[in-house]
Amino acid sequence: LRPSRVHNSEENTMRALTLKDILNGTFSYKTFFPNWISGQEYLHQSADNNIVLYNIETGQSYTILSNRTMKSVNASNYGLSPDRQFVYLESDYSKLWRYSYTATYYIYDLSNGEFVRGNELPRPIQYLCWSPVGSKLAYVYQNNIYLKQRPGDPPFQITFNGRENKIFNGIPDWVYEEEMLATKYALWWSPNGKFLAYAEFNDTDIPVIAYSYYGDEQYPRTINIPYPKAGAKNPVVRIFIIDTTYPAYVGPQEVPVPAMIASSDYYFSWLTWVTDERVCLQWLKRVQNVSVLSICDFREDWQTWDCPKTQEHIEESRTGWAGGFFVSTPVFSYDAISYYKIFSDKDGYKHIHYIKDTVENAIQITSGKWEAINIFRVTQDSLFYSSNEFEEYPGRRNIYRISIGSYPPSKKCVTCHLRKERCQYYTASFSDYAKYYALVCYGPGIPISTLHDGRTDQEIKILEENKELENALKNIQLPKEEIKKLEVDEITLWYKMILPPQFDRSKKYPLLIQVYGGPCSQSVRSVFAVNWISYLASKEGMVIALVDGRGTAFQGDKLLYAVYRKLGVYEVEDQITAVRKFIEMGFIDEKRIAIWGWSYGGYVSSLALASGTGLFKCGIAVAPVSSWEYYASVYTERFMGLPTKDDNLEHYKNSTVMARAEYFRNVDYLLIHGTADDNVHFQNSAQIAKALVNAQVDFQAMWYSDQNHGLSGLSTNHLYTHMTHFLKQCFSLSD
């Protein structure tokens, strides 16, 4: 009797998660990514904000920059020059789009402990970076690129045609930032800093999205962004390279575009330096099923870049678009001509291939009914990559090492058995020459970051183990999570189910489907999270399910490319199929089923609610796409083709939320959007609302004034509180 009484008292001290816990970030975790500066040294910002240099081999550490210096300019970020003579300090951070921001930069001279005076940097700067060797600086100011030989020198202006919203040099425009490069920069130093490559984006002919920003003034401001929607005029891109030692000699030299790409609309997709005098550019046709990788060499005699046809490698997809979400980038080997790259094998699984001369003669390095996800590093004798091979769980990530110095190459899983229950989803960060590396485990247990020897894989030390979080969770009744699969009509639907702490299979529970479902996404992952849905399960007794249906990633091309040219069909069908299977499990109250999603997930949740199945009582769409004609060209056309009569206009028209307005009559619908959403424009929700009003369908709506796609800050609290009330009302749960 006594043990059970003790057990009960322990149970009584346990508490459920509260919404406040989630909104306050009480159970957030930390990761540790070393800022590598050599094979055996890294920088890290300590808890008291000193910048500390750690030497793994000597075990010594010392402060290179004090928190006092950081605070003197209100620095929120820093960057050490490769020659270790200077540090840039970043302050006045001002966010623009997803990756882009402007900031003020100060240069601190470590040799004399003073800020560099004279020839100070202008403000605000759009992007700044050190050369890979020495302490040259490249920066972008007012859409033009400048070079500094040393921080105290006057700048050399490389471009002169930069113009707001018209010509972008060294930084991407909106669509390239969000949908192609996924960076705030579009300039790349050669390995030793001899050359600087950059992109110029000409947005002169792109239609502009305009929306009101209400602010606090008497009149709202109008925000104008050149934003190509599906089928519209796209940015015109050109790539230039300039010699940074003699920048005025011949000036920036344009890199030629492969003829087969230049014959119609095209994109530049990435640039990879191989050596100081060899560069690799990737190009993509506007119809994104053909990608060309072009290797170019510097011609000293002409001071130009030569891209011979023999060094063009074509990647083409016959079943969908090229690549996964993006076309993969090459990782070059030490011979500076052959490279490793991930692309689909003959069975339709993304795997690592070694290309020496032609893509046709590529040697497949990995194979199986799983996918290689990222190549981290290639050294003289090893290749490190991540995959979801282990135990056939697509939502896991383990790190592998292939020995490429020996034949046949041997493969070793570095992470599979380290902390098997706690850690099934890893990423890694390597020092120079992979002498050491950090592993960052994201779950399913509490995240942990560790340091390892690159030769032996031996764990050297724990960098971050989230002890405080572990202690804080000791008296919390967390929901149970399970990852399983459904086999339906030759399709495998992996799902994650989040169950209330005292889950009882004989009882009936309300079900909430959380959906994203976008092409090449993955929601069912073995990662740790204490978030809103954890609270809904822990405190409100809901069952939450996430399902990866057709169109999602890392399970082969058959699943991935199933949605090609017909977005909004199979993603929705598969959520509905899963719900029916969940009902069959016996513990779901089929009168209390809801669905919610954000962005692409808002689109899918809206279509699911309007599917006419009668399965869903209610649902929420946050910042949904409502018609693919309203979304960005680069993203939309990748999966849908063009909205023209001779291409795919019919499906563009058939796949809108508005076309299904009538079907919302029998569900409770909550539509939410930020009015300053630069990504999925408020227009999308405005059109849904208009269609519902025209159909005389009642619905609920919430807008967030001056908020973007992320609905951040105080809006986040309001949003989740509002959605919680809506769901509790829908599920008849007392407040």
Partner: antibody
Framework: EVQLVESGGGLVQPGGSLRLSCAAS????????MSWVRQAPGKGLEWVSW????????GYADSVKGRFTISRDNSKNTLYLQMNSLRAEDTAVYYC???????????WGQGTLVTVSS | DIQMTQSPSSLSASVGDRVTITCRAS??????LNWYQQKPGKAPKLLIY???SLQSGVPSRFSGSGSGTDFTLTISSLQPEDFATYYC?????????FGQGTKVEIK
């Protein structure tokens, strides 16, 4: 503080040789293009030669090509100009200057006078 | 080679005057044009680089403008220490060339 100090000037006979030196301090010498500029008495400025940061790349004015050789020793932070087959028209004050970005001369030495006369 | 032609070759002006010196290149040099001041027995001193950028420490009464082939140096209000010879210089193609100079004398 950037300093450039020239030395090695003097009187030399036509056809003779002279080696000028320029000692640099106050900046990272090995990172910059360096140059020689001359000024004949009462005349304007004339660029003579430049040398790249690593020392492998050089440029010369047509008037001195084949006779003058520019070099540098980055370990000693020193720039040199070897002048052979000197002519009367080479008489000038020779300035050592830093040629920033290969475009403008941002720092100059005080100059050293070379007189070519019999 | 790119030839640089300065005008006038000399000028007389008084303290407080606005002085303009022009420089023309024989072909387009974009904005790779620099201005120097030289006083007797001294080394030249950089005033303006890249056509319009003021070198650190140079008084703001000096300004530069132009691009392509035609450039101007302006001294908004001539000071006693500004009496000197001024040279323009182009920095294209790693073959720097100077103008013949403009001597600014006291009226």
């Amino acid at each position: 503080e950037v300093q450039l100090v020239e030395s090695g000037g003097g009187l030399v006979q036509p056809g003779g040789s002279l080696r000028l030196s320029c000692a640099a301090s106050g900046f990272t010498f090995r990172g910059y293009i360096m140059s020689w500029v001359r000024q004949a008495p009462g005349k304007g400025l004339e660029w003579v030669s430049w040398i790249g940061p690593e020392g492998s790349r050089t440029g010369y004015a047509d008037s001195v090509k084949g006779r003058f050789t520019i070099s540098r020793d980055n370990s000693k932070n020193t720039l040199y100009l070897q002048m052979n087959s000197l002519r009367a028209e080479d008489t000038a004050v020779y300035y050592c200057a830093r040629l920033l970005y290969g475009t403008w001369f941002d720092y100059w030495g005080q100059g050293t006078l070379v007189t070519v006369s019999s | 080679d790119i030839q640089m032609t300065q005008s006038p070759s000399s000028l007389s002006a008084s303290v407080g005057d606005r002085v303009t010196i022009t420089c023309r290149a024989s072909q387009s040099i974009s904005s790779y044009l620099n201005w120097y001041q030289q006083k007797p027995g001294k080394a030249p001193k950089l005033l303006i680089y890249a056509a319009s950028s003021l070198q650190s420490g140079v008084p703001s009464r000096f300004s530069g403008s132009g691009s392509g082939t035609d450039f101007t140096l302006t001294i908004s209000s001539l000071q006693p220490e500004d009496f000197a010879t001024y040279y323009c210089q182009q920095g294209r193609l790693l073959l720097p060339t100077f103008g013949q100079g403009t001597k600014v004398e006291i009226k």
